[in-house]
Interface confidence: medium
């Protein structure tokens, strides 16, 4: 099986239908279509999925039937191109339909929109949701897949099936509970938060593959799997990396049926070979398929083997370093990364990749030098500052987080990042800075040994959100530079940015700082976002404002909202007190 399976099947669509089963087949085709055509109504997608499913069944019955030998891209692309409103709804994406495969699929991929113009998902009343769930469970769950997939066009499809299974379980349990809301809402909140995190993590994997190539993704995978499975042999880790790369390449490329099928195969292989991979897999491997795959992906690091020899022996002291490097560069560097990562679960993956890059650069130079050994003898000394930089950064920021709490820590980051890249849109700065700020509550609680992998790898995910959002409408050369030059140095690149002295402050617009009584009915989170939006705008108007000035204005603003939300005539209060606040803020900031 594996890479060569395709040759053995006359009909790819029949093969995948049989492998996956009808339910998963339909769900994955729906996800694929929704991720490509993000604006199409639900009913249109369901119709297309049903047509594809009926066709797949004819191919299962007779693999030689007409068109059954066509590739999945051809079949799915032809189906998408039958959508009548393609030109009106998607504009130039309709031009993709004039192309042949594989160019047509590449064209569809390029038109995936990370920030589609879709209304925010508003959660109906619990009773309304439970009624809809009971009336038509299948449609209800399909709608969930559709709404998530169209808003997250790179969501890891087999994992979305796992989320849908949990979503269904939550409704099955809670719609029978005495207090439906108390049972259901926390579960839905958890699924929403986990879903956003899962989407962002997968988006980084796809960006890594698409923008930096397979080699970059494989390097990431070697480091991560070596940390997770330190007892596994290098050959075993290499095999897992190859298979995992294939799975993610397929999912990121829109080949969702192949991806889900190959992910299932990989989970099966891992469980069949867990003795040579990790002692932590036992529980995962007893679970059903979707839970099993999810569990393996999240499994804790195995214990490091005792008495691992010093790395210096093979990678610095050996007289065969240059010989080994020359004979198979990527294998030798892969071994270095494997050996370093399995010894350092306390390092972030991106740090390990920076160390490997430093080692590679040193060998590239020294193995062509007069005296190679003398040249690379002190290479490990070059690692020290690379290790200390994130350690110090995390220490400082965790201290700041503990001192300020999450909301104010987010505000500090909002100010910091707005000053670095003030050209970026306010909603993007708010979203990204809020997520950056969550690193505090997510990671600072951990002991020293777990802080860096938690924090820096999480920051890589969040900064990738900034990069993909910025790529859609580029406005800052500094963001472009940090996003495109090096995947592993994105965080240090952004950290090193100082205040953008070239930025011309935004004209003051009183409308931006005009608030209404509707703010009083918002949830605490939404109210925070409103205040943080105002903070970003303030910094854009007055980039040289001091922390103290901004704090004073924000404190006044919080008091103003609190006061007016308690007033009898809220709207009048917001109008009158708002004018005073704007005037006072202008004076305080010298606008």
């Amino acid at each position: 099986r594996g890479v060569f399976r395709r040759d053995a099947h006359k009909s790819e669509v029949a093969h995948r239908f049989k492998d996956l089963g009808e339910e998963n087949f339909k769900a994955l085709v729906l996800i694929a279509f929704a991720q490509y055509l993000q604006q199409c109504p639900f009913e249109d997608h369901v119709k297309l999925v049903n047509e594809v499913t009926e066709f797949a069944k004819t191919c299962v019955a007779d693999e030689s039937a007409e068109n059954c030998d066509k590739s999945l891209h051809t079949l799915f692309g032809d189906k998408l191109c039958t959508v009548a409103t393609l030109r009106e709804t998607y504009g130039e994406m309709a031009d993709c339909c004039a192309k042949q495969e594989p160019e047509r699929n590449e064209c569809f991929l390029q038109h995936k929109d990370d920030n589609p113009n879709l209304p925010r998902l508003v959660r109906p009343e619990v009773d309304v949701m439970c009624t809809a769930f009971h009336d038509n469970e299948e449609t209800f769950l399909k709608k969930y897949l559709y709404e998530i997939a169209r808003r997250h066009p790179y969501f890891y499809a087999p994992e979305l099936l796992f989320f849908a299974k949990r979503y269904k379980a939550a409704f099955t349990e809670c719609c029978q509970a005495a207090d439906k809301a108390a049972c259901l809402l926390p579960k839905l909140d958890e699924l929403r938060d986990e879903g956003k995190a899962s989407s962002a993590k997968q988006r980084l994997k796809c960006a890594s593959l698409q923008k930096f190539g397979e080699r970059a993704f494989k390097a990431w995978a070697v480091a991560r799997l070596s940390q997770r499975f330190p007892k596994a042999e290098f050959a075993e880790v290499s095999k897992l990396v190859t298979d995992l790369t294939k799975v993610h390449t397929e999912c990121c490329h829109g080949d969702l049926l192949e991806c889900a099928d190959d992910r299932a195969d990989l989970a099966k292989y891992i469980c069949e070979n867990q003795d040579s991979i990790s002692s932590k897999l036992k529980e995962c491997c007893e679970k059903p398929l979707l839970e099993k795959s999810h569990c393996i992906a999240e499994v804790e690091n195995d214990e490091m083997p005792a008495d691992l020899p010093s790395l210096a022996a093979d990678f610095v002291e050996s007289k065969d370093v240059c010989k080994n490097y020359a004979e198979a560069k990527d294998v030798f560097l892969g071994m270095f990364l494997y050996e370093y990562a399995r010894r350092h679960p306390d390092y972030s993956v991106v740090l390990l990749l920076r160390l490997a890059k430093t080692y590679e650069t040193t060998l590239e130079k020294c193995c062509a030098a007069a005296d190679p050994h003398e040249c690379y003898a002190k290479v490990f000394d070059e690692f020290k500052p690379l290790v200390e930089e994130p350690q110090n950064l995390i220490k400082q920021n965790c201290e700041l987080f503990e001192q300020l709490g999450e909301y104010k820590f987010q505000n500090a980051l909002l100010v910091r990042y707005t000053k670095k890249v003030p050209q970026v849109s306010t909603p993007t700065l708010v979203e990204v800075s809020r997520n950056l700020g969550k690193v505090g509550s997510k990671c600072c609680k951990h002991p020293e040994a777990k802080r860096m992998p938690c924090a820096e790898d999480y920051l890589s995910v969040v900064l990738n959100q900034l990069c993909v959002l910025h790529e859609k409408t580029p406005v800052s050369d500094r963001v472009t530079k940090c996003c495109t030059e090096s995947l592993v140095n994105r965080r240090p690149c952004f950290s090193a940015l100082e205040v953008d002295e070239t930025y011309v402050p935004k004209e003051f617009n009183a409308e931006t700082f005009t608030f209404h009584a509707d703010i009083c009915t918002l949830s605490e989170k939404e109210r925070q976002i409103k205040k943080q939006t105002a903070l970003v705008e303030l910094v854009k108007h007055k980039p040289k404002a001091t922390k103290e000035q901004l704090k004073a204005v924000m404190d006044d603003f919080a008091a103003f909202v609190e006061k007016c939300c308690k007033a009898d005539d809220k709207e009048t209060c917001f109008a009158e007190e708002g004018k005073k606040l704007v005037a006072a803020s202008q004076a305080a900031l010298g606008l």
Epitope: C322, K323, Y325, K365, C367, A368, A370, D371, P372, H373
Partner: antibody, heavy 119, light 111 residues
Framework: EVQLVQSGAEVKKPGESLKISCKGS????????IAWVRQMPGKGLEWMGI????????RYSPSFEGQVTISADKSISTAYLQWSSLKASDTAMYYC????????????WGQGTLVTVSS | QSALTQPASVSGSPGQSITISCSGI?????????VSWYQQYPGKAPKLIIY???KRPSGVSNRFSGSKSGNTASLTISGLQADDEAEYSC???????????FGGGTQLTVL
Amino acid sequence: EVQLVQSGAEVKKPGESLKISCKGSGYSFTRSWIAWVRQMPGKGLEWMGIIYPGDSDTRYSPSFEGQVTISADKSISTAYLQWSSLKASDTAMYYCARLHGVVSRGDYWGQGTLVTVSS
Amino acid sequence: QSALTQPASVSGSPGQSITISCSGISSLAGSYNLVSWYQQYPGKAPKLIIYEVTKRPSGVSNRFSGSKSGNTASLTISGLQADDEAEYSCSSYAGRNAVAVFGGGTQLTVL
């Protein structure tokens, strides 16, 4: 096609300064060492020193340390050999060579620059 | 930093084999196989003919071969031809921090 092109012959007086050049093309200039080699009239070859243009790391043979300066400008893929005060004994043919491979070997050479120092 | 020692000249008739020795290879250079041989015609730039003791760059005739025993490296040219007449220099490393050293060169004459 890998090429190293050196600047033309020079005739100088003792005490004068001089900078000769070696421009690389057809390969990644920043990722290979460049060596300078001296050959005095009727004599053998002598390694003078090497430079890695990627980071300007420079090493000199003991007998040339302090006598010459090796530098590089990676933006124009050019390495240099310079003297601040020439002596008659500096009269020689000077070659640049790209050092390449697992251990350095001069696999491509410039055509040579003849430097004559005479009063 | 002493130069490597080579014979000043060797000669041979067409079709014969000759060997040029190069003594004084440091143990470091020996362990890393850091020995190269260059051919140079009068008025021309040197040309690499052997590197890492025994390896030939592409385009170099297999009549040229290299070997090493102890602290001495050797270049053997079999089936001598008239156009092999040239100066041959070995090169290696003198030790830590040294750039490299050449031997004094050997003039090969084809009789």
